[in-house]
């Protein structure tokens, strides 16, 4: 029996992989900050957890994915106002009862140190300093990420 | 435990300066996340929001007494110190510092300390 | 004139369940700062009662309870007892970068 968080992300998930496979992206586009290989939307509006996540695929991205403790203190860097949290692509499976990114793939417990408790509803919030577990149904601000495509140089042969 | 508490004399004139020192233990300001503010409370009244220091030594001020406030803090010694300039009958009330902690909430007050201004 | 917005004054017999609503706009409460509630008794400093919307410190009994929607917030208290008389205040963040608190509500138990 899978919550309707979790559905939301397997449709989403699903529909994308549907899609024709798109050019990648070489440039950030206006609006979106450039971390890495990643492109980030930082919202001024506030949303629950489903709704930011739905509103990240209107953007043709996704809700923030980190990949370890490196990126997470990039990212935070970023947060300008210490008071602000944001939403990212973390939530709690209570199928498998761990945390789990929208992608499908679990969280290294090693990665993010997770103020709060690990149950039923609760999404992760980041702030400039932590990370937090926190009621899916709060309405806080949320970041996207689109990756970028990495520019190869083409070999061409001696004529 | 966590503790912090005011000090600073309890009356000054008006056009004076008033200095406050909040004395703290049972945390770091260097510590990523924490903080100190200052609230006062003049009497019988709502609380009013001052100051407020971070841990980066970022600082932020109430906009209506920005131009007469000044924080700053002393890791070493535990200390933050808070200086109102060109006091007021109006200033008049119980100064509070309080620890900034999870959540952004000031989770820890001092006991506060009146200060009167009066000629 | 305080930025976030509360009544005066409520009151209830004991036993009873009150709420105190904490008014702000889309840029505080409604911008996605979290709303922190204190307890002010009688000739003492205020005290954490509420964190984050609806958290609870240790030693803060199951009676509180914090909610928060759009640009409102409220707090609850179930079961009111005399020892709950106090003045209650909230507070939030602002997109200006500064701290706002209510103005604070006077809790009398009947």
């Known amino acids: 029996q899978k919550s309707s968080i979790e559905k939301c992300s397997v449709d989403i998930q699903q529909s994308r992989n549907k899609t024709t496979e798109r050019p990648g992206l070489l440039n950030c586009p206006i609006y979106w900050q450039q971390l890495r290989e990643k492109c980030l939307l930082f919202s001024h509006t506030v949303n629950p957890w489903n709704n930011s996540l739905a509103d990240c695929s209107t953007k043709e991205s996704s809700l923030l994915l980190i990949r370890d403790k490196d990126e997470l203190i990039h990212t935070q860097n970023l947060i300008r106002d210490k008071a602000i949290l944001f939403w990212i692509g973390l939530n709690f499976s209570l199928s498998e009862k761990n945390w789990k990114w929208i992608n499908g793939s679990f969280l290294n417990s090693n990665d993010l140190e997770i103020r709060g408790d690990a149950k039923e509803n609760s999404c992760i919030s980041i702030s400039q300093t932590s990370v937090y577990s926190e009621y899916c149904s709060t309405e806080i601000r949320w970041i996207c990420q689109k990756e970028l495509t990495p520019v190869r140089n083409k070999v061409y042969p001696d004529s | 435990q966590i503790t912090l508490k005011e000090s600073g004399p309890t009356l000054v004139k008006p056009t004076q300066t008033l200095t406050l020192t909040c004395t703290f233990s049972g945390f770091s300001l260097s510590t990523s996340g924490v903080g100190v503010g200052w609230i006062r409370q003049p009497p019988e009244k709502a609380l009013e929001w001052l100051a407020l220091i971070y841990w980066d030594d970022d600082k932020l001020y109430s906009p209506s007494l920005k131009s007469r406030l000044t924080i700053t803090k002393d890791t070493s010694k535990n200390q933050v110190v808070l200086t109102l300039t060109n006091m007021d009958p109006v200033d008049t009330a119980t100064y509070y510092c309080?620890?900034?902690?999870?959540?952004?909430?000031?989770?820890?007050w001092g006991q506060g300390t009146m200060v009167t201004v009066s000629s | 004139q305080s930025v976030l917005t509360q009544p005066p004054s409520v009151s209830g017999a004991p036993g009873q369940r009150v709420t105190i609503s904490c008014t702000g706009s889309?840029?505080?409460?409604?911008?996605?700062?979290?709303v922190h509630w204190f307890q002010q008794l009688p000739g003492t400093a205020p005290k954490l009662l509420i964190y984050?919307?609806?958290y609870r410190p240790s030693g803060v009994p199951d009676r509180f309870s914090g909610s928060k929607s759009g640009t409102s917030a409220s707090l609850a208290i179930a079961g009111l007892q005399a020892e709950d008389e106090a003045d209650y205040y909230c507070?939030?963040?602002?997109?200006?970068?500064?701290?706002?608190f209510g103005g604070g509500t006077k809790l009398t138990v009947l």
């Open positions: 984050g919307n609806r």
């Open positions: 309080a620890r900034l902690g999870m959540r952004h909430a000031f989770d820890i």
């Open positions: 507070q939030s963040y602002d997109s200006s970068l500064s701290v706002v």
């Open positions: 889309s840029s505080n409460i409604g911008a996605g700062y979290d």
